[in-house]
Every structure is written in structure tokens, then in C-alpha cells.
């Protein structure tokens, strides 16, 4: 039995649970998902039994090997998978455990602006980047373009301080998860701040 294998898949995609064995006479191979039987294979008997009929079209064995390919992945396929290789030549079954994380392809992140102030010709605010559907394991970074050197900022909140008269800047939020990334619409500092330009000491949401 090897260490737990961590696998990552995307909704609608496929993942292969790698499995090899040099056992000559394999009596059966049993795959389970969160303790529920998924597939039972009898290589010598030539039979493959998929416990739930709806999974039949999703199960495959690349190149006729022992590895299990699961396609048309859904979010709720995330969980613990376990395989046991049973053979009369083994004193106890050979086992392997896998943890599968299924992630959605990220949609365009949404940007909201916090309280804005404009003091002494400097526009100060925060931009917050978030996913509308609360997707998991999302990492946010900000790209600030337009100054002499382009800058990056980690985290969902970007503090902005932009002085009127400086060259315009563009802010873009990048949202990433283990299977995809997406970009917010670009935000121009001048446009962002012009709402507060008329009143040098104003604050707005």
C-alpha cells in the first residue's frame, strides 16, 4: 500500500487514478468512493461491474490497464477513492487510497470598490475581487499596469493611492484555482477616481 495520492480534476473533465500491479493472478479489483462500491473487476473472468448504472458511461480503463479513468466529472465526485487488489497469491489485498478534488472552471471575477476619499488631489480606495458563486480554493492576485514598472499584489484586496496628474493606471484582478484562471475587466484609475474629483474631500462607496 502506497501513500495517499492527491488528484485534481475540473468539472466536466476527466481524471485517471493510476494503478499498476505485477501480480500474475488477480482475482478481483474493487474500487470504492467514500466507502460506496464503484466498480468491481475480475480480469480472469473478463467482467467489469459498475455498481451504479449512471456511472457506466463515465468509467474507462486506458490501454486496457488497471488504472481507472473517470470522466464527466461533477463537483460531488470530490472525495476519497480506494482500490483493493485481491489475489490468492497475496496474503492480504494490495491497496491504494486517492483523494480527488474537483474544481469548477472559474468565471470572470467581480470587482467592488470600497469607501473612496479624495484628499489633496490623491484618490484613495480599496478594490476587492471576489467570485460571485463562492468557488473554493481561489487565489487572487492584482496586476497594476501603467507605471514605469508593472506591479503585482497578492490577495483579494488592492489598496489604491492615485494622484491626479499622474499617468493613468490599469488594475486587473487575476483569480486562479488548481484547474483554471480568469481575469476581471480592466479598471482605469482615472475613471475610478473621477467620481470624487469634483469634491477634493469627498468619500463615496
Amino acid at each position: 500500500s502506497g501513500p495517499v495520492k492527491e488528484l485534481v480534476g475540473s468539472v466536466g473533465g476527466a481524471v485517471t487514478f493510476p494503478l499498476k500491479s505485477k501480480v500474475k493472478q488477480v482475482d478481483s479489483i474493487v474500487w470504492t468512493f467514500n466507502t460506496t462500491p464503484l466498480v468491481t473487476i475480475q480480469p480472469e473472468g473478463g467482467t467489469i461491474i459498475v455498481t451504479q448504472n449512471r456511472n457506466r458511461e463515465r468509467v474507462d480503463f486506458p490501454d486496457g490497464g488497471y488504472s481507472l479513468k473517470l470522466s464527466k466529472l461533477k463537483k460531488n465526485d470530490s472525495g476519497i477513492y480506494y482500490v483493493g487488489i485481491y489475489s490468492s497469491s497475496l496474503q492480504q489485498p494490495s491497496t491504494q487510497e486517492y483523494v480527488l478534488h474537483v474544481y469548477e472552471h472559474l468565471s470572470k471575477p467581480k470587482v467592488t470598490m470600497g469607501l473612496q476619499s479624495n484628499k489633496n488631489g490623491t484618490c484613495v480606495t480599496n478594490l476587492t475581487c471576489c467570485m460571485e458563486h463562492g468557488e473554493e480554493d481561489v487565489i487572487y492576485t492584482w496586476k497594476a499596469l501603467g507605471q514605469a514598472a508593472n506591479e503585482s499584489h497578492n490577495g483579494s484586496i488592492l489598496p489604491i493611492s492615485w494622484r491626479w496628474g499622474e499617468s493613468d493606471m490599469t488594475f486587473i484582478c487575476v483569480a486562479r484555482n488548481p484547474v483554471s484562471r480568469n481575469f476581471s475587466s480592466p479598471i482605469l484609475a482615472r475613471k475610478l477616481c473621477e467620481g470624487a474629483a469634483d469634491d477634493p474631500d469627498s468619500s463615496m462607496v
Partner: antibody, heavy 120, light 108 residues
């Protein structure tokens, strides 16, 4: 990639023996069953038997016991089939074919075939 | 030994047609049936194993179904390159494995 390369055509006399070879590459030769299949001209397929190169274990179709002898050499990844006491009914194309792991009776890679002609 | 019977030795079809080839086992072989394609002058090629599992790289127009004693191999939309002989084979439990007599698919 998996390849099975068989020896060339044989023309043999009745009563003689012949040994044909099948050299495997691109996979773990020792841990997959190797099958042999006969096809007479214009006819169907007949399973002769199989060998597990890892330990030399063999399984034969009863019809070919005493006719075919299967062996394997792990060091050269080569399987052999010897056919003895040949008669005209042994004239055929003989294929070696690897078993899949998931269903050991299904054969996924085949050699190009070796033609054996028995004639005086 | 288990006898595999393919009732049609020849089948004629047109490009784009759907065609089904049947195979009957003389006793219950569960789902342990494979289908092979053999083109003239070539080695057989595995298409389907365990009755309905398409081998890697095989186009999805080829499908297999059945269990027990009755099995069907279907080409959903025949292509010119599908001209070949198709064999069923039982790979159930203890050998010997046995093949059907083959069905030659001819294109009209």
C-alpha cells in the same frame, strides 16, 4: 510504444517441426500474458494457448496440446511457439498477441503474423 | 468448449448507415466478450472488450452491448474504412477462448 515483431515466413516439410518467435518491446514483458492465435487461409481465428513470461506458466487449448509448445525468454523479451509433427492442416498464419491487464482474455496488441506453409 | 456463433457471414451496408452484428454464445459468458476488426492482409485489432468497453483510441461510432449469451456490435455511421471482417470472442474465465466465425462487412 508497444510492438510485437514476429519471425519471417516458414516453408516446412510434413512431419517436421518449426519454431516461430515474437519479440516484444515497449511494455513489461514479464507481467503480461502472451497468446498465440491461428488463422488458416480465408478462415477464422483459433486460440492456441498463452504463456506468462514471468514464471513460464502456460495454458493450452486442448486441441493444440501436443501440437504446440509455448516458451518465453525474459532476457530477450521474446516468446516462442514450437509446432511439431506438421501436416497440411497446420498451414496457417500464426499471430502472437498480448493480453490486456483488465481482461486477460482480450488481446490488445498483435504481431504481424508468421506464415507457415507445410508442403513436400 | 464455448461456441460463439455469428449468424451473418456477410453484411452489406452503405456509408453513413447504422449496422449491427450479432453474436450468440452457447452458454452464459456474463459480459466477457471482445470484438475485433481485421482488414485484408492485417492483424486483428481490438475494438471492444468486456462486452461494452471501447479500447483506447477506438472511434466512438463503434459500440458493444449484451450479456449472458446474446451480444451486439454496432457501427453507428459506417465509414468506407470500416470495410473489414469483424470477430466476436468470449474471454470468460478459464480458457480456451473461442472466436465467432467472423462477419465480413461490405460497402455497397
Amino acid at each position: 510504444q508497444v510492438q510485437l515483431q514476429q519471425s519471417g515466413p516458414e516453408l516446412v516439410k510434413p512431419g517436421a517441426s518449426v519454431k516461430i518467435s515474437c519479440k516484444a518491446s515497449g511494455y513489461a514483458f514479464s507481467s503480461s500474458w502472451m497468446n498465440w492465435v491461428k488463422q488458416r487461409p480465408g478462415q477464422g481465428l483459433e486460440w492456441i494457448g498463452r504463456i506468462y513470461p514471468g514464471d513460464g506458466d502456460t495454458k493450452y487449448n486442448g486441441k493444440f496440446k501436443g501440437k504446440a509448445t509455448l516458451t518465453a525468454d525474459k532476457s530477450s523479451s521474446t516468446a516462442y511457439m514450437q509446432l511439431s509433427s506438421l501436416t497440411s492442416v497446420d498451414s496457417a498464419v500464426y499471430f502472437c498477441a498480448r493480453s490486456t491487464m483488465i481482461a486477460t482474455g482480450a488481446m490488445d496488441y498483435w504481431g504481424q503474423g508468421t506464415s507457415v506453409t507445410v508442403s513436400s | 468448449d464455448i461456441v460463439m456463433t455469428q449468424s451473418h457471414k456477410f453484411m452489406s451496408t452503405s456509408v453513413g448507415d447504422r449496422v449491427s452484428i450479432t453474436c450468440k454464445a452457447s452458454q452464459d459468458v456474463s459480459t466477457a466478450v471482445a470484438w475485433y476488426q481485421q482488414k485484408p492482409g492485417q492483424s486483428p485489432k481490438l475494438l471492444i472488450y468486456s462486452a461494452s468497453y471501447r479500447y483506447t483510441g477506438v472511434p466512438d461510432r463503434f459500440t458493444g452491448s449484451g450479456s449472458g449469451t446474446d451480444f451486439t456490435f454496432t457501427i453507428s455511421s459506417v465509414q468506407a474504412e470500416d470495410l473489414a471482417v469483424y470477430y466476436c470472442q468470449q474471454h470468460y474465465s478459464t480458457p480456451p477462448y473461442t472466436f465467432g466465425g467472423g462477419t465480413k462487412l461490405e460497402i455497397k
